[in-house]
Interface confidence: medium
């Protein structure tokens, strides 16, 4: 939704205000692995980077593994995703308020290249899971998110039978499947090489753009 | 601009099929799943089933399993559901409706009113 | 696997009120809700955790809690008198359910 980032007026190069995001973008020379994308402009630490790496991080205690051991090519996305979560300083156009224990602000309908969720759904959707959205419904009792009674672990494809029940339905609709391909400078890409720059600063600004905020 | 437009209205006879068409625009079609949901006159909605407009896979409700069949032509852009068996219960206003996660439905088409009459 | 919603609610003008839907799919899934108006296809009013799609005014929320789902409308207008309907994902069998529908009466 165009105008989710209604409290905010920078938009640009902006963090959000969440559980483990610097409060103002910079450097960060060791962003880890995956993160790495991100270290010439980031809100995100070194450490946090590191964590999230992890197979139930102690930045949120969620366990990928929930249904079994997620494969390697579909868990990468899910890093990757993170990655995107923690560390971009460019979605302040999909900054959206919220009323949560954990965090004050949330991404909603951030637009993500089409190829990124494709191949995001056709990397997973042979793992296992119990849930089709995965903010709601778990079962926290022993700290780690469990499947709750009831909840059959069952292919990817099953909970998320298209890429965009995946994209759009796994965190509530932080992302929207763009119409737009990588390089277009009109999707977010999950996705980049930092040797030609971060292209989401350029979607960022288009966005901001649109809405008449500078 | 996202759009779903729907074939015009039927008449049928008991024991006839009727097919519907649902063509979309304005999206990328295969990335998202089509739904139909019916609603007789007076009465509240009703899901009939979704396919799958990327691969293809279908999945019906109980109560029309057996009578309903839903398919999609990509290069058209376009998804159908076709009921059997009619009878005069099946008189109803039929959507299609895009889902952006799972039940949730953000693009519907204008509908297509259904009338079984001898 | 049901949805129940009130037939009937209503509000004066400006005022508030709350259409809720239960059901056992709702502890594990968020509900949608749907304005539809006579002789008019259904609208997507929120859907997910708390989401409003671009054209939806601020005066629509929704929440959840357990098994319950409410639609809060804050300031009803007369525009809003129309039929509510919730739905959600049945996650067993990959269905989707819908409640029986609110007709809200704006006084």
């Known amino acids: 939704t165009m105008c989710s980032a209604q409290d905010r007026t920078d938009l640009l190069n902006v963090c959000m205000d969440a559980k483990h995001h610097k409060t103002k973008p910079g450097p960060e020379d060791k962003l880890h692995d995956q993160c790495s994308p991100w270290k010439k402009n980031a809100c995100c630490t070194a450490s946090t980077s590191q964590e999230l790496h992890k197979d139930t991080s102690r930045l949120y205690n969620f366990n990928w593994d929930h249904c079994g051991k997620m494969e390697p090519a579909c868990k990468r996305h899910f890093i990757q995703d993170t990655c995107l979560y923690e560390c971009s300083p460019n979605l302040g156009p999909w900054i959206q308020q919220v009323n949560q224990s954990w965090r004050k602000e949330r991404f909603l309908d951030v637009p993500l290249c089409k190829e990124d969720c494709q191949r995001w759904w056709e990397d997973c959707h042979t793992s296992h899971t119990c849930k089709s959205n995965w903010h709601r419904g778990w079962d926290w009792t022993s700290g780690v998110n469990k499947c709750p009674a009831g909840a059959l672990c069952r292919t990817f494809e099953s909970y998320f039978p298209t890429p965009a029940a995946l994209c759009e339905g796994l965190w509530s609709h932080s992302y929207k499947v763009s119409n737009y391909s990588r390089g277009s400078g009109r999707c977010i890409q999950m996705w980049f090489d930092s040797a030609q720059g971060n292209p989401n600063e350029e979607v960022a600004r288009f966005y901001a753009a649109a809405m008449h905020v500078n | 601009e996202v759009q779903l437009v729907q074939s015009g209205a039927e008449v049928k006879k008991p024991g006839a099929s009727v097919k519907v068409s649902c063509k979309a625009s304005g999206y990328t079609f295969t990335s998202y799943a089509m739904h139909w949901v019916r609603q007789a006159p007076g009465q509240r909605l009703e899901w009939m089933g979704w396919?799958?407009?990327?691969?293809?896979?279908?999945k019906y409700s109980q109560k029309f399993q057996g009578r309903v069949t839903i398919t999609r032509d990509t290069s058209a852009s376009t998804a159908y559901m076709e009921l059997s068996s009619l009878r005069s219960e099946d008189t109803a206003v039929y959507y299609c409706a895009r889902d952006i996660s799972y039940g949730s439905f953000d693009y519907w088409g204008q509908g297509t009113l259904v009338t079984v009459s001898s | 696997m049901e949805l129940t919603q009130d037939p009937a609610v209503s509000v004066a003008l400006g005022q508030t009120v709350r259409i809720t839907c239960q059901g056992d799919?709702?502890?594990?899934?968020?509900a949608n809700w749907y304005q539809q108006k006579p002789g008019q296809a259904p609208v997507l009013v929120i859907y997910?955790?708390?989401n409003r799609p671009s054209g939806i005014p601020d005066r629509f929320s929704g929440s959840s809690s357990g098994n319950t789902a409410s639609l809060t409308i804050t300031g009803a207008q007369a525009a809003d008198e129309a039929d509510y309907y919730c739905?959600?994902?049945?996650?067993?069998?990959?269905?989707?359910?819908f409640g029986g529908g609110t007709k809200l009466t704006v006084l």
């Open positions: 799919s709702l502890r594990s899934n968020y």
């Open positions: 739905d959600s994902r049945v996650s067993t069998g990959n269905h989707v359910v």
């Open positions: 997910g955790q708390n």
């Open positions: 396919i799958n407009a990327g691969n293809g896979n279908t």
